[in-house]
Interface confidence: low
């Protein structure tokens, strides 16, 4: 390509007339501000191209970038495309315009930027001050392209005199964009609402100051458009948030709320996706099994676990025998209610130090305006069995009795043995169980009676060995669910002058 | 209906103390986070302090830590805030709110109070 004036730099007068002329062996056309001009085209005989761009009554508003190139779809090199650069100075033009685009500058990294204030005079001095500043900035100037820098995120205008005159230029914005990939988070005041309940949804990204939302969501499939509302979270910087309210949701509400967003700088996309529900009313539900009849061991803490599903949030109260229970002042009682998930609850009745009195019937009771459930069972305190009496007497009839009395919840079973060698007894020699067989010329007579009050069984076993000729080691064991205790006499016969 | 009901504002000396309680009624009452939040004329409401039912979890906002704590009566259904070393920046409409969120938006609570004025002079 040849142009004519070569250039690179021109300067001409204001009014005047100026032809610009590019040759070149394919078609070639003249472009001003990606724009092609008026201009005559030629082709000469032999077969070089020319384009003639003619410029007639010049003003400052004709300075400006000049390019010659070829005019057909193949891909150009770089010498195949010419610059020029025309200065019209013209004391009626100051700066040169802006687009409106020109005037906010967006970064997204540390980097050069041209603040394009250009004035149509090369012999100009421009200086470059903050917008409320009157100190020159300390950046090179290029008449061609303007102030270029590191710049702080401000607002910067360019001065220039001419003549008598100062002539200020645009505000121009520099903005420092955060731009990094995107993590979406979506999240819902409740996943689960009430029909009439409000749906109200975030989708918040962070680490962007540049992104788009998109929601789509059940009623946006059948046309009903919901408005989102966007904003910036100021006690977080780069959090952004949409948010999504639905007034009155409808059951047909019910469904997934997908949240994309699109970072416009990279390019960069990420979407996040909530189930809801929406019910007709709102309800209770057990989960899991709580057996009717539950056990607690004497002066041991207890605690007792009810789980369940609930909107809207219920309350929840434990009743003993139909009495309303609440945290004892005395700490023998702790009752909470865990919020485990949005909607799932564990209620927890605790008794600290068991005590007989304890023992009943336990209900608890969650509701709420909708829907209520209630879960009751049996409280049985478990006492470990003592043994409270073991006694030897022998009544006239001839034959000797052994007493053995005991307490204890559950009832205790009651088991007798007996060993006759004293001296290997019952370390060598196992002992023999008792009552179960005629052999041992014993009879056994057991009675058990329950105790309201202290509610607990009590056993009366007495046992009658027809004769004893020589001393016996006689034991008494009682036996529970939670343990055993046991005792043990000596029986000596009757001709024998001691007893042990 | 849920009602929440603020109690104990005044004016107090910089340095002095106040304790806000907050009675809530209503039959159904059940949120599980109760919080405190504040005014001044032509500003947003801004958070104070929340506390879970268990009370096993508060959260307090910067300005205020160190100096207020939240505390609740569950046999009362009441939420009590004890604002000790008072500033004059400290001076606004106390809110009580009641919500199943600790959270500092406002959003997240279903149910608030009418308010009580806090007052402190320099």
């Known amino acids: 390509l040849v142009v004519t004036p070569p250039g690179p730099e021109l300067v001409l007068n204001v009014s005047s007339t100026f032809v610009l002329t590019c040759s070149g062996s394919a078609p070639v056309v003249w472009e001003r501000m990606s724009q092609e001009p008026p201009q005559e085209m030629a082709k000469a005989q032999d077969g070089t191209f020319s384009s003639v761009l003619t410029l007639t009554n010049l003003t400052g508003l004709d300075t400006g970038e000049y390019f010659c190139t070829h005019n057909d779809s193949r891909g150009l090199e770089t010498d195949e495309r010419k610059r020029l650069y025309i200065f019209v100075p013209d004391p009626t033009v100051g700066f040169l315009p802006n687009d409106a685009e020109e005037l906010f500058i967006f970064l997204t990294e540390i980097t050069e930027i041209t603040i394009p204030c250009r004035v149509t005079d090369p012999q100009l001095v421009v200086t470059l001050h903050e917008k409320k500043g009157d100190v020159a900035l300390p950046v090179p100037y290029d008449h061609q392209r303007g102030f270029s820098g590191i710049f702080e995120d401000r607002s910067y205008i360019c001065k220039t005199t001419i003549g008598d005159r100062e002539v200020d230029s645009d505000a121009y914005y520099v903005y420092r964009l955060q731009v990094s990939s995107i993590n979406v988070s979506v999240n819902a005041v409740q996943t689960v609402v009430r029909q009439g309940e409000n749906i109200t949804l975030m989708c918040i990204v962070i680490g962007n100051e540049v992104v788009n939302f998109e929601w789509t969501y059940p009623r946006k499939e059948s046309g009903r458009l919901v408005e989102p509302v966007t904003d910036f979270l100021l006690d977080m910087p780069y959090h952004i948030r949409s948010i999504l309210h639905i007034p009155s949701a409808e059951l047909e509400d019910s469904g997934t709320y997908t949240c994309n967003v699109t970072e416009s700088v990279n390019d960069h996309q990420d979407e996040k996706a909530i189930n809801i529900t929406v019910v007709e009313s709102g309800y209770v539900r057990l989960l899991g099994e709580v057996g009717t009849l539950q056990f607690a061991e004497l002066h041991r803490s207890r605690t007792l676990q009810v789980v369940f599903e609930a909107y809207p949030p219920p309350t929840v109260l434990w009743f003993k025998d139909n009495r309303t229970l609440g945290d004892s002042s005395a700490g023998e009682i702790a009752l909470s209610t865990r919020n485990v998930s949005e909607t799932r609850y564990v209620s927890e009745l605790t008794l600290v130090r068991v005590k007989v009195a304890e023992a009943g019937h336990y209900t608890m009771r969650a509701f709420h305006e909708d829907a209520e459930v209630q879960l009751s069972f049996q409280l049985q305190i478990n006492v470990p069995v003592r043994v409270l009496e073991l006694s030897e007497s022998h009544p006239d009839s001839g034959e000797q009795t052994v007493r053995c009395r005991g307490r204890g919840m559950p009832q205790p079973n009651i088991i007798w043995s007996a060993c006759r060698d004293l001296k290997r007894c019952p370390r060598e020699l196992p002992p023999t169980l008792l009552g179960n067989s005629s052999e041992e010329e014993s009879q056994l007579e057991t009675n058990v009676t329950y105790w309201e009050e202290e509610q607990e069984f009590e056993v009366v076993s007495t046992l009658r060995l027809q004769h004893v000729d020589r001393p016996l080691s006689v034991r008494c064991t009682l036996r529970n669910a939670v343990g055993q205790d046991t005792q043990e006499v000596i029986v000596v016969p009757h001709s024998l002058p001691f007893k042990v | 209906e849920v009602q929440l009901v603020e109690s104990g504002g005044g004016l107090v000396q910089a340095g002095g103390s106040l304790r806000l309680s907050c009675a809530a009624s209503?039959?159904?009452?059940?949120?599980?986070?109760m919080g405190w939040f504040r005014q001044t004329p032509g500003k947003e409401r801004e958070f104070v302090a929340a506390t879970r039912w268990t009370a096993a979890s508060t959260h307090y906002a910067d300005s205020v830590k160190g100096r207020f704590t939240i505390s609740r009566d569950h046999a009362e259904n009441a939420v009590f805030l004890q604002m000790n070393s008072l500033k004059p920046e400290d001076t606004a409409v106390y809110y009580c709110a009641a919500g199943n969120y600790l959270d500092t938006a406002q959003y997240r609570y279903n149910y608030w109070g009418q308010g009580t004025q806090v007052t402190v002079s320099s």
């Open positions: 209503g039959r159904s009452f059940s949120s599980s986070v």
